[in-house]
């Protein structure tokens, strides 16, 4: 799913207030809901009919530093006999997510949001024929 | 996938620099990679063997304001005959993502990162028997 562009009003103060300095805002360092947990079934990446592998990318100047990307293992889907059925397609499910980028020039540290496209897993779909007009 | 807790050093300046005021940092207002696009196959939510619906939640004090959640349509998966096969399970694929929360008290505006658990879609898995020890 696509994250829309940030509205120019999002970072502004209410109209009745004095304007903020252009270009930066105050970011509180705590993270809301930091302890909430993913409640996903176990090992779905290997038990799925459209299985996938994970690759981890690491960047110490990004939060989260670790971003995990899924890659579908097959073009087709795995049938009840454990064989690849190419009448179906394994396709990635993608999600735009935000990360926090740390930038420093000497002793000046600032942060900026960054959009990252994450492939979260794969699903098995019926392909459709494209009829040329 | 789970986002780890933010390390206490992430918001700190290099050791040789004077310390920052506790609790807040400078957030640049632009967003890096704002124009990148999701390149997902069309209508996969309806073509999947584990189809799903979308629900949109809206919050003007959050960026992105719109967060889309998927819900699997069936307990089982759709077979080649279009029937629900309950020997398989439709299960949600979840992803922890970050959003930016806007907080204002009068004319004071600050921002804070918030973790949100998003169900991105569904995949079809083979259930396994839990063997009692």
């Amino acid at each position: 799913r696509k994250i829309p562009k940030v509205g120019h009003t999002f970072f502004q103060k209410p109209e009745s207030c004095p304007p903020v300095p252009e270009g930066s805002m105050k970011l509180d360092t705590g993270i809301i809901n930091e302890n909430q947990r993913v409640s996903m079934s176990r090992n779905i990446e290997s038990r799925s009919t459209s299985p996938w592998n994970y690759t981890v990318t690491w960047d110490p100047n990004r939060y989260p530093s670790e971003v995990v990307q899924a890659q579908c293992k097959h073009l087709g889907c795995i049938n009840a006999q454990g064989k690849e059925d190419i009448s179906m397609n394994s396709v990635p499910i993608q999600q735009e997510t935000l990360v926090l980028r740390r930038k420093h020039q000497g002793c000046s540290v600032s942060f900026q949001l960054e959009k990252v496209l994450v492939t979260v897993g794969c699903t098995c779909v019926t392909p459709v024929v494209h009829h040329v007009q | 996938r789970k986002i780890p807790k933010v390390g206490h050093t992430f918001f700190q300046k290099p050791e040789s620099c004077p310390p920052v005021p506790e609790g807040s940092m400078k957030l640049d207002t632009g967003i890096i990679n704002e124009n990148q696009r999701v390149s997902m196959s069309r209508n996969i939510e309806s073509r999947s063997t584990s189809p799903w619906n979308y629900t949109v939640t809206w919050d003007p004090n959050r960026y992105p304001s719109e967060v889309v959640q998927a819900q699997c349509k069936h307990l089982g998966c759709i077979n080649a005959q279009g029937k629900e096969d309950i020997s398989m399970n439709s299960v949600p694929i979840q992803q922890e993502t970050l959003v930016l929360r806007r907080k204002h008290q009068g004319c004071s505006v600050s921002f804070q990162l918030e973790k949100v658990l998003v169900t991105v879609g569904c995949t079809c898995v083979t259930p396994v028997v839990h063997h009692v020890q």
Epitope: S39 | E84, I86, V129
Partner: antibody, heavy 123, light 107 residues
């Protein structure tokens, strides 16, 4: 000892409501999907409803859809069945049963059953 | 929905004899068939799942076979405690369904 104990059954008039409960013990409740299965007097078994470990996936038999609601409270190791708009044909012994699947998913085969609670719908 | 038809409705045998119970599905259920035993006044007990796998704690005299539409539960040598009603159940297509039962009685 692995055990399921149902309660909440009774005699109720058509159109009224009843809430059944099932208390689980002896196993990690939130590791498993749970089901309600009923048996009309002198008849066979009929699957009624099922719920996965975190209540994210729920299913109902057509005969009860829109009238019955299954739910669970993992903190209390309890399963529930809210039965509204009851009909004479809902008269049965209602069993709570544990699914055999790992990871709280559905296998739809059930290896632990309670002794049942009787629901009688009659005017 | 898939209809499961069990036969015979009643089977009269003596202890020590071999019992063969049948379950036929209205369409293929692959191997996704289970067998349950129910004694009077008791809850059902899972015997066999996926056509031929014995559930935990089930004696070896119980065995299941078949795939597609025709399935068999065999009790190799009947014990007095085996006289009960037996149900088959499919988990192939929505909704899960049970057969009407076979009553195994002492001859």
């Amino acid at each position: 000892e692995v055990q399921l104990v149902e309660s909440g059954g009774g005699l109720v008039q058509p159109g009224r409501s009843l809430r059944l409960s099932c208390a689980a013990s002896g196993f990690t409740f939130d590791d498993f999907a749970m089901h309600w299965v009923r048996q009309a007097p002198g008849k066979g078994l009929e699957w009624v409803s099922g719920i996965n470990w975190n209540s994210g996936s729920i299913g109902y038999a057509d005969s009860v859809k829109g009238r019955f609601t299954i739910s669970r409270d993992n903190a209390k190791n309890s399963l529930y069945l809210q039965m509204n708009s009851l009909r004479a044909e809902d008269t049965a012994l209602y069993y709570c049963a544990k699914d055999i699947a790992a990871a709280g998913e559905f296998y739809f085969d059930m290896d632990v059953w309670g002794q049942g609670t009787t629901v009688t719908v009659s005017s | 929905e898939i209809v499961l038809t069990q036969s015979p409705a009643t089977l009269s045998l003596s202890p020590g004899e071999r019992a063969t119970l049948s379950c036929r599905a209205s369409q293929s259920v692959s191997s996704y068939l289970a067998w349950y035993q129910q004694k009077p006044g008791q809850a059902p007990r899972l015997l066999i799942y996926d056509a031929s796998n014995r559930a935990t704690g089930i004696p070896a005299r119980f065995s299941g076979s078949g795939s597609g539409t025709d399935f068999t539960l065999t009790i190799s040598s009947l014990e007095p405690e085996d006289f009960a009603v037996y149900y088959c159940q499919q988990r192939s297509n929505w909704p899960p369904t049970f057969g009407q039962g076979t009553k195994l009685e002492i001859k």
